[in-house]
Interface confidence: medium
């Protein structure tokens, strides 16, 4: 025969999940940090396509003799975006160029705007967070999470998709950014660096943390992901920085202990349900918020980012396991899977607490605080 040829939050509990202030003096950026963190969204930072088929990829099957059958891809039909809330828009990240780049990459061709024009947008993510410039918004209330404590059954799918490790979440995980701003969790995934090299996506005053968790949510105003892509507030991501601490994090260990099973790109395993909120900081009241984009193609904008002020602590061994176990495309380790920080282009990052009014040693000179834009929200 012949044939022709898919992450972003929850609490740790107990108040011991991490440092309440991620901005200590020792956190100043190091010279060895990945040069990409300084880059604008240049072409070298722009990933390529994922494995949804390109229109040119889609074939009609032309029967041949039984001896030499053929599955042809030239005219293959695509699948329209499914009606399930958890499902992505097939057409949103299709490689129109027909260059057979079925996987986008970090730090290589093809340029991300060629994969998805939205990647060249003005309001992209991740960004550098400067607490001194954040606008304190008392209207930003503590986040509310409901149904995040999952029973062991049904099991969840944990997958190495070639650019992250992703845990697909079942229906029923509800999150509210505030009154009338309700969301359902879809999946979570991580971003990390390599040995001695941090790999968070967001940075704080230029400092990159060892890793970052993203829990991706869909607004209850939309039935499907494809409807929400690019719509203001259609998607919301909870993000938390992961740092090194003295003890093993038992919540994360439930996932990290299974990474060897999915070392190969494209492999997956089933893990018992767990308390997803235990993967997040315990303090849901102190966070930064801004409107940005998905940090990988299709880079759709309108995404509400909520970045916790408190960090989550993992042991050194756990951080090493995260950054040194998985493999990506082409026999390369899956490492440094973060996008360079993007310009704010006039955006104001809001804070749910007075982040700019502290005695941080980094405030070299008085700074004019931005005013809260969401006071009436």
């Amino acid at each position: 025969q012949r044939l022709p040829r898919m992450q972003e939050d929850s609490p740790l509990g107990g108040g011991s999940s991490g440092e309440d202030d991620p901005l200590g003096e020792e956190d100043l950026p190091s010279e060895e940090d990945s040069p990409r963190e300084e880059d604008p969204p240049g072409e070298e930072d722009l990933p390529g396509e994922e494995d949804l088929p390109g229109e040119e990829d889609l074939p009609e099957v032309k029967p041949k003799s039984e001896e030499e059958g053929s599955l042809k891809l030239e005219d293959l039909p695509t699948v329209e975006a499914p009606g399930d809330p958890q499902e992505p828009q097939n057409n949103a990240h299709r490689d129109k160029e027909g260059d057979d780049q079925s996987h986008w990459r970090y730090g290589g061709d093809p340029p991300w705007p060629r994969v998805s024009p939205a990647c060249a947008g003005r309001f992209q993510s991740p960004v550098d967070i400067r607490p001194q410039l954040a606008a304190f918004c008392p209207a930003l209330r503590p986040l509310e999470l409901l149904g995040f404590q999952l029973p062991p059954l049904p099991e969840l799918r944990l997958r190495n998709n070639g650019h992250s490790v992703q845990l697909t979440l079942p229906p029923g995980l509800e999150m509210a950014l505030g009154p009338g701003r309700e969301y359902r969790a879809l999946q979570l995934h991580l971003h990390w660096g390599a040995a001695g090299r941090p790999g968070s996506e967001h940075t704080v005053e230029g400092h990159r943390f060892p890793a970052e968790i993203h829990v991706v949510h869909l607004s209850t105003a939309f039935a499907r992901v494809d409807e929400a892509l690019g719509r203001p507030g259609g998607l919301a991501v909870l993000a938390a920085f992961l740092e090194e601490g003295p003890e093993e994090n038992s919540a994360y260990e439930q996932l990290l202990s299974r990474l060897e099973e999915i070392a190969e790109e494209g492999s997956e395993t089933q893990v018992p349900g767990l308390d997803i909120s235990a993967l997040l900081p315990s303090d849901f009241s102190r966070y930064f918020q801004y409107e940005g984009s998905l940090t990988t193609p299709p880079c759709a904008q309108g995404v509400i980012w909520t970045v916790f002020n408190q960090t989550v602590m993992l042991s050194a061994k756990q951080l090493h396991t995260l950054s040194d176990t998985l493999w990506g495309p082409g026999d390369s380790r899956l490492q440094l899977n973060f996008r360079a920080t993007q310009p704010l282009n006039g955006r104001v990052i809001e804070a749910s607490f007075p982040a700019g009014v502290d005695s941080s040693p980094r405030a070299a000179e008085p700074v004019q605080l931005n005013s809260c834009l969401a006071a009436g929200d």
Epitope: L3, P4, R5, M6, Q7, E50, D51, L52, P53, E56, D57, L58, P59, V61, L71, K72, L73, E74, L76, P77, T78, V79, P82, G83, D84, Q86, E87, P88, N90, H93, D100, S102, H103, P154, E155, R157, R159, N161, G162, H163, S164, Q166, T168, P170, P171, Q187, H189, V216, V225, E264, E265, G266, S267, Q270, L294, T296, P297, P298, W327, P329
Partner: antibody, heavy 118, light 107 residues
Framework: SGPGLVKPSETLSLTCTVS????????WSWIRQPPGKGLEWIGY???????NYNPSLKSRVTISVDTSKNQFSLKLTSVTAADTAVYYC??????????????????WGQGTTVTVSS | ETQLTQSPGTLSLSPGERATLSCRAS???????LAWYQQKPGQAPRLLIS???SRATGIPDRFSGSGSGTDFTLTISRLEPEDFAVYYC????????FGGGTEVEIK
């Protein structure tokens, strides 16, 4: 492609060649259909070599991939008459973007008939 | 392993009539990873629906899928002569399984 007749206790070997596109970054499945019966999934392989097999056949099945030839192959050991079927290869579509989703088998080969008989 | 049971086994209808095919799972389908296929004699199956309700490109809108959890339905609103075939549902959870099929025959 492969032999249409296999003797009991021997190994059935089939190869599926992908044309008109790259085998890379997709999952590729084998499915079979005994005469007059329904479809049975045998297993799939990712272009990287990761596999997932039907638990009932796992002990006898090996699926491999040769990206340089744009081919993937099926080996089924210790065959019996119950393995007589039309064997199909198909593209199994999973998205691998920031969202995971399963789309189904969207491209199929025309099938090859394998008879197990002495 | 999730078992899929399709009913009825055979559906005898006339062109222009409405066909309703059922697929029931032994346990809840993981995030509605359920697909429907059409197979005509001597041909390979053809993907109709994925995600329980989304038509594959090129599939006429008389085909629609619905359902969630354990109960799923494929509806053909108005049967055309070319729609008489066998229809299979398929799920993807820990493993991948097909239903036993429903034959839609001309009355």
């Amino acid at each position: 492609s492969g032999p249409g007749l296999v003797k009991p206790s021997e190994t059935l070997s089939l190869t599926c060649t992908v044309s008109g596109g790259s085998i890379s970054s997709y999952y590729w499945s084998w499915i079979r259909q005994p005469p007059g019966k329904g479809l049975e999934w045998i297993g799939y392989i990712y272009y990287s070599g990761s596999t997932n097999y039907n638990p009932s056949l796992k002990s006898r099945v090996t699926i491999s991939v040769d990206t340089s030839k744009n081919q993937f192959s099926l080996k089924l050991t210790s065959v019996t008459a119950a393995d007589t079927a039309v064997y199909y290869c198909a593209r199994d579509q999973h998205s691998s973007s920031v969202y995971y989703y399963y789309y189904g088998m969207d491209v199929w080969g025309q099938g090859t008939t394998v008879t197990v008989s002495s | 392993e999730t078992q899929l049971t399709q009913s009825p086994g055979t559906l005898s209808l006339s062109p222009g009539e409405r066909a309703t095919l059922s697929c029931r799972a032994s346990q809840s389908i993981y995030i509605n990873y359920l697909a429907w296929y059409q197979q005509k004699p001597g041909q390979a199956p053809r993907l109709l629906i994925s995600g329980a309700s989304s038509r594959a490109t090129g599939i006429p809108d008389r085909f629609s899928g619905s359902g969630s959890g354990t109960d799923f339905t494929l509806t053909i609103s108005r049967l055309e002569p070319e729609d008489f075939a066998v229809y299979y549902c398929q799920q993807y959870g820990r493993s991948l399984t097909f239903g036993g099929g429903t034959e839609v025959e001309i009355k």
